[in-house]
């Protein structure tokens, strides 16, 4: 895994998929904080499967965006502001 210092902070960057010369599309990219700590005893008691370590992380997402039409007539999101927010993971 890359070193955390190699990952830029969560910020607006040019979207390589939908940008064109003179018409950049921006997207939120980069890293947010994560931390791990011993699971508090009171939390452990509520767990079906007890875990000794609890981890918290946030993900880089758009705080605001505009929907724009690009060449080809389809719409994409042009992000205008970013923040670190709750990560959502769905199991397959």
């Amino acid at each position: 895994a890359p070193d955390v210092q190699d990952c830029p902070e969560c910020t607006l960057q040019e979207n390589p998929f939908f940008s064109q010369p003179g018409a950049p599309i921006l997207q939120c990219m980069g890293c947010c904080f994560s931390r791990a700590y011993p699971t508090p005893l009171r939390s452990k008691k509520t767990m079906l499967v007890q875990k000794n370590v609890t981890s918290e992380s946030t993900c880089c997402v758009a705080k605001s965006y505009n929907r724009v039409t690009v060449m080809g007539g389809f719409k994409v999101e042009n992000h205008t502001a970013c923040h670190c927010s709750t990560c959502y993971y769905h199991k397959s």
Epitope: P16, F17, Q20, M29, M71, G72, F74
Partner: nanobody
Framework: QVQLQESGGELVQPGGSLKLSCAAS????????MGWFRQAPGVDREAVAA????????YYVSSVKGRFTISRDNAKNTVYLQMNSLKPQDTAVYYC???????????WGQGTQVTVSS
């Protein structure tokens, strides 16, 4: 010539899951970014997800982030869209398309219908 063939679309209940596949031929797969797009009746086509040739860069429209996952298997010339926690508003025809590094989304598949309904 470039050919893209989507599969996996079907009728599914809200909250269900589907995995779409898009098999590509007639191109050097690793030279292309791949994308999934969708179009519902009366609505503009929108980009749902995209993935770079190496898989290290992705894009998701906000409405599917955390529910959909795009991936690719370069050995099989195939791109996938794993769709979880499906909602009625995900109902659309889903298309895959390819984009060369120095080009645009000029090659499209025929689409596969996804219907989310109880």
């Amino acid at each position: 010539q470039v050919q893209l063939q989507e599969s996996g679309g079907e009728l599914v209940q809200p909250g269900g899951s589907l995995k779409l596949s898009c098999a590509a031929s007639g191109l050097t797969f690793t030279n292309y970014s791949m994308g999934w797009f969708r179009q519902a009746p009366g609505v503009d086509r929108e980009a749902v997800a995209a993935i770079s040739w190496s898989g290290d860069n992705t894009y998701y429209v906000s409405s599917v982030k955390g529910r959909f996952t795009i991936s690719r298997d370069n050995a099989k010339n195939t791109v996938y869209l794993q769709m979880n926690s499906l909602k009625p508003q995900d109902t659309a025809v889903y298309y895959c398309a390819v984009k060369p590094d120095d080009g645009w989304w000029d090659y499209w598949g025929q689409g596969t219908q996804v219907t989310v309904s109880s």
